[in-house]
């Protein structure tokens, strides 16, 4: 993941009776919140494998890099991070692992100056439309976030609460059009079977989608046509059987784009032979030299780049261990 | 949860037109494709054509180009197919349907009956 | 246009057999290929997308297999609350198209 990692300086930590006697006002300039380090040189404060169950209140107003890792959050409500005065320095905040399965609207208000966040390896059965935009106006103020890591944050399938986990999480990157500054995106690991059509067409400043280790099977109806700045694509490890011709030809157009395509159960059949063809030609793929034939049996672990139109015939019938990743 | 109310059943003339709303709700309206397809008596199914809500984009099935027009009200989550020069051949059940996974849809409306008699 | 050909157009069944739908492309769709169900008064409803997905709450009686221009749809062990008619729909080129449907009745 992207998120800042700590600064060499020293830090200090609080002794707990501390923080419960002065939360409810404003934190004195070098207050550090109980269960957590604190370093006013390196404006950063760790909260870490403490089993907090809410975010401090007395957070100190310097802070610009915030750690709320490997807790036990489970909530994060409406304002979680709003206080007076503002924090206002925060530009990073690493909530990943703490237990978190629902953000409600509003959480991240009152942080102008918020562009890295990340809620990775939290189960977020309830991620509200809101959580990034604040509001649900249907165009929202623009929010400052850069950088938004969301990998692994699908809930176990009990817990899905009977509705579209993919609709759920591109619902609260869409809304209000808050996230059009957007520049590094990160899905990874989320089962995620498909994406909705155009979505990607509304995040226009995206420079790095990474999309790996899902259950994608198609990209047909995923445009990267406006994606103009995107530099790095990652689909490794998903269920792609083929990519055709509108894919390739828009992955090609990007002037910067570096694809991944790695461990995909590629189907070597008479429709891959535009792919193929366009493999030997196309710089943007890494790795392309990797890439094998799953199906049919025949052409398993054939290289792709090694093929030619004889090879590619059709038409086979998948068995089922294809059907589905 | 995700509901699509459609406007009621129409019985008009030949020759006349009609246009059946769709309001959405459950959902935001703007992240996904909205399909209209007509189920003619004891028949199949059949595409008229999708819109994106977002920009009012259409896709038409060529059968349908010269007898459909959708529309969206972004501003209250409604979608509209205007039906024109209708025949008898147009007496059918009109639905709206959401996009969940790309072309498949996920929500559908009630329906709305429309027959076309003299 | 792409022709989905479905068959049987009818099904008579008793609970508890297995059933078998086919729905054959004109050529092929990948793997975009939905299935749907549609009780008598009803709305259709989602059950099966990009070809073996079941949609979510659909029960695990419900399966779809296939790639390119064959596929199937089947269900494991019928019940009486399965009586519909069933159709397959492509979404791999516009115009979307559908299947002619298939009916199960009980015995």
């Known amino acids: 993941s992207s998120s800042p990692t700590s600064s060499a300086s020293s830090f200090s930590s609080s002794a707990p009776f501390l923080a419960s006697a002065v939360s409810a006002q404003p934190p004195l300039p070098d207050q550090c919140p109980a269960l957590c380090e604190c370093s006013e040189a390196a404006r950063t404060v760790k909260c870490v494998n403490r089993n907090l169950t809410e975010v401090p209140t007395d957070l100190p107003a310097y802070v610009r890099n915030l750690f709320l890792t490997g807790n036990q959050l489970a909530v994060l409500p409406a304002g979680a991070f709003a206080r007076r005065p503002p924090l206002a320095e925060l530009a990073a905040l690493n909530l990943s692992g703490s237990r978190l399965d629902e953000v409600r609207a509003g959480a991240f208000e009152h942080l102008p100056s918020l562009r890295q966040l990340d809620l990775s390896h939290n189960p977020l059965a309830d991620l509200s439309p809101f959580a990034f935009s604040g509001s649900n106006a249907s165009v929202s103020a623009p929010s400052p976030l850069v950088e938004l890591i969301l990998n692994h944050i699908v809930p176990p399938e009990d817990e899905r609460q009977n509705r579209s986990f993919e609709g759920m999480v591109v619902a609260a990157l869409l809304a209000g059009r808050a996230l059009q500054g957007l520049r590094r995106l990160e899905l990874a690991s989320n089962h995620f079977l498909y994406l909705p059509r155009d979505v990607l067409a509304q995040l226009p400043s995206l420079r790095h989608l990474d999309l790996s280790n899902n259950s994608l099977v198609s990209l047909t109806y995923v445009s990267f046509r406006n994606l103009t700045h995107l530099e790095s694509l990652h689909l490794e490890d998903n269920a792609l059987k083929v990519l055709h011709n509108g894919t390739l030809a828009e992955l090609q157009g990007l002037p910067h784009i570096r694809v991944f395509l790695d461990n995909n159960p590629w189907v070597c059949d008479c429709h891959m032979a535009d792919m193929v063809t366009w493999l030997k030609e196309t710089e943007v793929v890494q790795g392309k030299d990797r890439l094998t034939c799953a199906y049919p049996e025949k052409m398993r672990n054939r290289v792709l780049l090694e093929l030619n139109s004889a090879d590619l015939d059709c038409d086979p019938i998948l068995p089922p261990s294809l059907q589905t990743s | 949860q995700v509901q699509l109310q459609q406007s009621g059943p129409e019985v008009v003339n030949p020759g006349a037109s009609v246009k059946i709303s769709c309001k959405a709700s459950?959902?935001?309206?703007?992240?996904?494709?909205m399909n209209w397809v007509k189920q003619s008596r004891g028949k199949s199914l059949e595409w008229i054509g999708d819109i994106n809500p977002n920009n009012g984009g259409t896709n038409y099935n060529q059968k349908f180009k010269d007898k459909a027009t959708l529309t969206v009200d972004k501003s209250s989550n409604t979608a509209y197919m205007e039906l024109r020069s209708l025949t008898s051949e147009n007496s059918a059940v009109y639905y709206c349907a959401k996009e969940g996974p790309p072309g498949a849809m996920d929500y559908w409306g009630q329906g709305t009956s429309v027959t076309v008699s003299s | 246009n792409i022709v989905m050909t479905q068959t049987p157009k009818f099904l008579l069944v008793s609970a508890g057999d297995r059933v078998t739908i086919t729905c054959k492309a004109s050529?092929?769709?990948?793997?975009?290929v939905a299935w749907y169900q549609q009780k008598p008064g009803q709305s259709p409803k989602l059950l099966i997308y990009?070809?073996?997905n079941r949609y979510i709450g659909v029960p695990d009686r419900f399966t779809g297999s296939g790639y390119g221009t064959d596929f199937t749809f089947t269900i494991s062990t019928v019940q009486a609350e399965d009586l519909a008619v069933y159709f397959c729909?492509?979404?791999?080129?516009?115009?979307?198209?559908f299947g002619g449907g298939t009916r199960l009745e009980m015995k």
């Open positions: 459950g959902y935001t309206f703007t992240d996904y494709y």
């Open positions: 729909q492509q979404v791999y080129s516009s115009p979307f198209t």
């Open positions: 050529q092929s769709v990948s793997n975009h």
């Open positions: 990009y070809v073996s």
